[in-house]
Amino acid sequence: EEELQVIQPEKSVSVAAGDSATLNCTVSSLIPVGPIQWFRGAGPGRELIYNLKEGHFPRVTAVSDPTKRNNMDFSIRISNITPADAGTYYCVKFRKGSPDVELKSGAGTELSVRAKPSAPVVSGPAVRATAEHTVSFTCESHGFSPRDITLKWFKNGNELSDVQTNVDPAGKSVSYSIRSTARVLLTRRDVHSQVICEVAHVTLQGDPLRGTANLSEAIRVPPFLEVTQQSMRADNQVNVTCQVTKFYPQRLQLTWLENGNVSRTEMASALPENKDGTYNWTSWLLVNVSAHRDDVKLTCQVEHDGQPAVNKSFSVKVSA
């Protein structure tokens, strides 16, 4: 006559987080009398998951009615699976006694939990950098399982190659995190550029998650300055123009100095945007030539985005 067999037919079961997991177990015999217990893990530190005989296990239910006559199916269903439930589960037959005596264990079923990665969060540099400088962007996503994951960086649709990616922890874990850094060379045309961090994982059914960052948050395009004089007007007034072009962001203060003395200060606001996302601004200064005996040195002083001021000077000739 065959001895008691405890049969766990599946070596492994994979379940999506939030779903229910069914762990199958049947016994070949109702003898000897005694309960079936389910454990996660083996050895002295194993965790009791379900005991037919006693106890309250709110997330665990028996698939078959354990009180039914001739029941030899001791499969269980665990609801609302989380990554913390991952592990190997053993169905163990005990023989009635005081205490019950462990008789035979099933081979175990490894439960792996498929958990979606969190939405990737992309963060850029803390301070703006100018064109021709390289800045770093970081992308992070957490809580996924299994460990296999793919992360790609794109700038304006083109994949970036200067990338360093780590998945933690290195060993076995219930869930994992990914952190990736991409180095991006800025150009003056990058105000409208975007970097995208794209994460692909088995749980996403081919529909990757994306995190984005706008280079407008990371770039500073310093202005070009040009000071020109319009032709003398009949009333002895000269119109001097300071053209500030191709700058970003808009935060800009312009100061006119006449022979080193502040004449007027203006703040840029509500400027129209160029196609490339930069701004232009033109400021005029009327100089009354008849009020001066000597040539007038006009300076257009621009302070852009908190950077040191840039000056451009122009001398207005006063005829004797």
Epitope: S29, L30, P32, V33, T67
Partner: antibody
Framework: RQLVESGGGLVQPGGSLRLSCTAS????????ISWVRQAPGKGLEYIGT?????ITYFASWAKGRFTGSKTSSTAYMELSSLRSEDTAVYFC????????????WGQGTLVTVSS | DIVMTQSPSSLSASVGDRVTITCQAS????????LAWYQQKPGQAPKLLIY???TLATGVPSRFSGSGSGTDFTLTISSLQPEDFATYYC???????????FGQGTKVEIK
């Protein structure tokens, strides 16, 4: 699905007897067979349960004098060193108690120990 | 060994009556629920009514119910029928495999 006992009869004190319990309509391989007796006009008394070779157990009063064995269709119980107080109807039932209660039962076989 | 004490040992009742039989164990039964109830009529084998203290066996009328846990158990017949006049036995199991003991029986007779 039923159990049928046989082997009862008249036996002298000190004698032995072998009772059989044959299943029809189901297999005994995955079930224990328990034996219960009932002396004339008295209540029920549990004797023991026959499982596999190693899983066979008897009430403390029956140990040593009563033994059992089982195939997939028939269970046996050997009664030895019989005494007059062993006179009873002997029933077999499928099951080993707790979540495997005694059901169904055989009709019983009478064992009379008398000189 | 576990000792099962049934009461009363006999009772007289009429058809339609509610009948209650109790069974007390000398110690907690195994799993607090290793208690079954059997019905036996003269010249017949016992028949399973209730197991695991409160689970109704297949084919048993719903007027039979079992309750209790640990050491104190009850069999209730909600409305006695003519075919229910019989002797009722409880069977309790202790922690040892072979420690199964019947109560002495309760005979339900027609009043």
């Amino acid at each position: 699905r039923q159990l049928v006992e046989s082997g009862g009869g008249l036996v002298q004190p000190g004698g032995s007897l072998r009772l059989s319990c044959t299943a029809s309509g189901f297999s005994l391989s995955s079930h224990g067979i328990s034996w219960v007796r009932q002396a004339p006009g008295k209540g029920l008394e549990y004797i023991g349960t026959i499982g596999t070779g190693v899983i066979t157990y008897f009430a403390s009063w029956a140990k040593g004098r009563f033994t059992g064995s089982k195939t997939s269709s028939t269970a046996y119980m050997e009664l030895s060193s019989l005494r007059s107080e062993d006179t009873a109807v002997y029933f077999c039932a499928r099951g080993s108690a707790w979540n495997d209660p005694f059901d169904p039962w055989g009709q019983g076989t009478l064992v009379t120990v008398s000189s | 060994d576990i000792v099962m004490t049934q009461s009363p040992s006999s009772l007289s009742a009429s058809v339609g009556d509610r009948v209650t039989i109790t069974c007390q164990a000398s110690q907690s039964v195994y799993g607090n629920n290793d208690l079954a109830w059997y019905q036996q009529k003269p010249g017949q084998a016992p028949k399973l009514l209730i197991y695991l203290a409160s689970t109704l066996a297949t084919g048993v009328p719903s007027r039979f119910s079992g309750s209790g846990s640990g050491t104190d158990f009850t069999l209730t017949i909600s409305s006695l029928q003519p075919e229910d006049f019989a002797t009722y036995y409880c069977l309790g199991g202790g922690d040892d495999e072979a420690d199964n003991t019947f109560g002495q029986g309760t005979k339900v007779e027609i009043k």
